[in-house]
Interface confidence: medium
Amino acid sequence: KTGSEDCSKNFTSPNGTIESPGFPEKYPHNLDCTFTILAKPKMEIILQFLIFDLEHDPLQVGEGDCKYDWLDIWDGIPHVGPLIGKYCGTKTPSELRSSTGILSLTFHTDMAVAKDGFSARYYLVHQEPLENFQCNVPLGMESGRIANEQISASSTYSDGRWTPQQSRLHGDDNGWTPNLDSNKEYLQVDLRFLTMLTAIATQGAISRETQNGYYVKSYKLEVSTNGEDWMVYRHGKNHKVFQANNDATEVVLNKLHAPLLTRFVRIRPQTWHSGIALRLELFGCRVTDAPCSNMLGMLSGLIADSQISASSTQEYLWSPSAARLVSSRSGWFPRIPQAQPGEEWLQVDLGTPKTVKGVIIQGARGGDSITAVEARAFVRKFKVSYSLNGKDWEYIQDPRTQQPKLFEGNMHYDTPDIRRFDPIPAQYVRVYPERWSPAGIGMRLEVLGCDWTDSKPTVETLGPTVKSEETTTPYPTEEEATECGENCSFEDDKDLQLP
């Protein structure tokens, strides 16, 4: 395209400015530019927009419906990592904080109207994860760190006085209310990045207009990594119904039985008093907040397609390169979805030796080319092996049996699960499905760890029998609903350690 020469740029310095070409003049037509911020491990990228004005459709219905000129922001490499958001018009994107290591912006302009463009600044901030970190941080509904644009709902009450943006815990002006009270309605929060969700605090609201109180007495929780594939949180086989508020002002805290790894959260009221009104806080942490828990590049695209391989593959659409956590809508399917246990494997070459401390495993959705039915598959149990040279392999061992450890996998095709283990030195990591869903084997993956220099494995860890302590549920066995007055704090913080 005519305007695109030399408009793409990589940013590696500790801070900088990213601007549309020609800024502060109007941007040129026919641009396709990519701006990529690359951060070293343990660095968080903070991106703040100062000026934002792109052409938009005056009839545009929702945010992200950009027809003419737009800026896409990606968690990772463009079109590989997940899309955080598509922006146009004059509504300035709110501050973004990424700990994935790569944040990319792609700027597209058409051949017609040009506006003033954008100017943004970024900072790289050092983050040193704490060894005893507790995963119970308020995620930002009350503080505002979760921006208004991240909060939405199935519908909003017609008078404009009960919007999703009024659903912040302790907000002093009403709360969120749907157009009509029904258990089909929901309040949705986009956390933008994959986040560990460990607890939810809710309040009702008292109408400023009528002084009447409304509150949600119970709700269901739904989660999604992409905003399209949703899972209702379950307790055992049944949908979990959380007991919520008993009046319009008290805060009730519900801790999850085990953390959920998700990006999108929906609260779906089931019963209510007089009408639905909701104020909310979410608690949890980022995966990367734990020590040596960087995402090593499957999600972001830092690991190239050529570094992902498998024992077999069904066809191109569901090849190993589709096995990227979250960012792939499909996933890897082996040639025979119902293989023999331990026969199939998915392998990641990390490029250089790393300290590996865990994997995030996710199911997959894809097609069965014979029946043309979309399969929603996941792996229920798996083993992990690792190698420094690609030839000599070791399984992660179960310290009790001295046999290869059988890890718990997924229970749903979209919801990812983290499985951690003692640090291992590895350049190559293989996951072997052992048991799977009725739809067969389907998998997406991320590897967690850090540079070898950051966390040198001990001599003991390097030995042939690797000690492994898989923390599946270091949580209370039952969810608890707790009334917690003005300030929600976790009385027993050890309940909510990272898995």
């Epitope: 009450y157 017609s158 008078d159 404009g160 207009e209 009528t210 009447n212 008093h273 009408g275």
Partner: antibody, heavy 121, light 108 residues
Framework: EVQLVQSGAEVKKPGATVKISCKVS????????VHWVQQAPGKGLEWMGR????????KYAPKFQGRVTITADTSTDTAYMELSSLRSEDTAVYYC??????????????WGQGTLVTVSS | DIQMTQSPSSLSASVGDRVTITCTAS???????LHWYQQKPGKAPKLLIY???NLASGVPSRFSGSGSGTDFTLTISSLQPEDFATYYC?????????FGGGTKVEIK
């Protein structure tokens, strides 16, 4: 089916107290407000007050404050309106009403049949 | 309190006539909080229109509502014999809720 059934007509002397009942069925009384509305003969509708049955929280119109008491008994799904120190101008039909589907704006989709109270010496 | 003033207080019309009743609030009322009721002699009021323009269940489409701010209107496009009744507007935008004085629609 939602129904509000009120107690029968009453004749009271000035200075007396009247207590009218409103039995609801077809929905959980604890989850909604019950309002009371007065209509004097040949006159319009006047809101008297309401109760949040869940926690017995009440609100009254300034005109009736101090003379009206609204209560509820969840065991029988019944709301009550008591008006004291009756005077002749309290002669009216009294309605209970509930805004089940429009609690926020309080449009009254369901009404009792009304109870006529006559205050006469 | 928000005062609701209806006009006219009564009107005479024939079957088939188009009838318009207005309701004026003493201060602005959000359209979500303005409703209309119909009441026949000896009966309880019946919800006719809620949120300014939404017909309650079972209400014929000849009834319609409109307005915003302080001025609201109830229209009956073609008056039918069963429509002869008293009509009340009602706000609950501010507590206490208040009703208009009523408009009696009589047969000419």
């Amino acid at each position: 089916e939602v129904q509000l059934v009120q107690s029968g007509a009453e004749v009271k002397k000035p200075g007396a107290t009247v207590k009218i009942s409103c039995k609801v069925s077809g929905f959980n009384i604890k989850d909604y407000y019950v309002h009371w509305v007065q209509q004097a003969p040949g006159k319009g509708l006047e809101w008297m007050g309401r109760i949040d049955v869940h926690d017995d929280e009440t609100k009254y119109a300034p005109k009736f404050q101090g003379r009206v008491t609204i209560t509820a008994d969840t065991s029988t799904d019944t709301a009550y309106m008591e008006l004291s120190s009756l005077r002749s101008e309290d002669t009216a039909v009294y309605y209970c009403a509930t805004p089940i589907y429009g609690a926020r704006e309080a449009w009254f989709a369901y009404w009792g049949q009304g109870t006529l109270v006559t205050v006469s010496s | 309190d928000i005062q609701m003033t209806q006009s006219p207080s009564s009107l005479s019309a024939s079957v088939g006539d188009r009838v318009t009743i207005t309701c004026t609030a003493s201060s602005s009322v959000s359209s979500s909080y303005l409703h209309w009721y119909q009441q026949k002699p000896g009966k309880a009021p019946k919800l006719l229109i809620y949120r300014t323009s939404n017909l309650a269940s079972g209400v014929p489409s000849r009834f319609s509502g409109s307005g915003s701010g302080t001025d609201f209107t109830l229209t009956i496009s073609s008056l039918q014999p069963e429509d002869f009744a008293t009509y009340y507007c009602h706000q609950y935008y501010r507590s206490p809720p208040t009703f208009g004085g009523g408009t009696k629609v009589e047969i000419k």
